[in-house]
């Protein structure tokens, strides 16, 4: 059956979000990144549950800390300045979850490193894309 245009748009937005998150993860994992050890000391809150677009609220709330850690890296690995990357992500997240959402994010008890955090949200995006395909 043909995919609806709204579903296609959601898929493309998720793909764009994935691209940005994978770009950050690649930059962090780059073997030339000398600040990786320090970056891994920063802790991020993880969602208790992330299965629907509304759960992107949990990602949105962690974007400021993410930007701060990326600024620390001062790396050319990210292809864009951290501020621009986070701005891109923020715009997409707002479009995907809806700006009028009243969803209250619930966080897991355990915090995570930046790598675990990014992996979690990349997995989330890929999972939603797969269900929409």
């Amino acid at each position: 059956a043909p995919t609806s245009s709204s579903t296609k748009k959601t898929q493309l937005q998720l793909e764009h979000l994935l691209l940005d998150l994978q770009m950050i993860l690649n930059g962090i994992n780059n073997y030339k990144n000398p600040k990786l050890t320090r970056m891994l000391t920063f802790k991020f809150y993880m969602p208790k549950k992330a299965t629907e677009l509304k759960h992107l609220q949990c990602l949105e709330e962690e974007l400021k800390p993410l930007e701060e850690v990326l600024n620390l890296a001062q790396s050319k690995n990210f292809h864009l300045r951290p501020r621009d990357l986070i701005s891109n992500i923020n715009v997409i997240v707002l479009e995907l979850k809806g700006s009028e959402t009243t969803f209250m994010c619930e966080y897991a008890d355990e915090t995570a490193t930046i790598v675990e955090f990014l992996n979690r949200w990349i997995t989330f995006c890929q999972s939603i894309i797969s269900t929409l395909t």
Epitope: E15, L19, Q22, L25, N29, Q126
Partner: nanobody
Amino acid sequence: EVQLLESGGGLVQPGGSLRLSCATSGTIFSGYTMGWYRQAPGKQRELVAVISGGGDTNYADSVKGRFTISRDNSKDTMYLQMNSLRAEDTAVYYCYSREVTPPWKLYWGQGTLVTVSS
């Protein structure tokens, strides 16, 4: 080292056509999601077109009906056919290839400049 190499950019008049190519090493081609995004000075990066490992395609509203993404698995190459080009399509175009499973490797090229001007 894994590389993606774009080609086909250049100067074209409004209403004209260009075909961009993205040549990859075979290890990152089959099964990977691939796409094209563009960056114009002072603008947000825009994801233009995507093609999955299975061949499903998706386009930004701004290029729908004008651009066509395709891939030739036998040549490890992806293409972006751009027709009815407009001034607002002027940008550096980058191709990328990404894993759809952990460790989520991402590769992208150096970009090719497309200028639409009379």
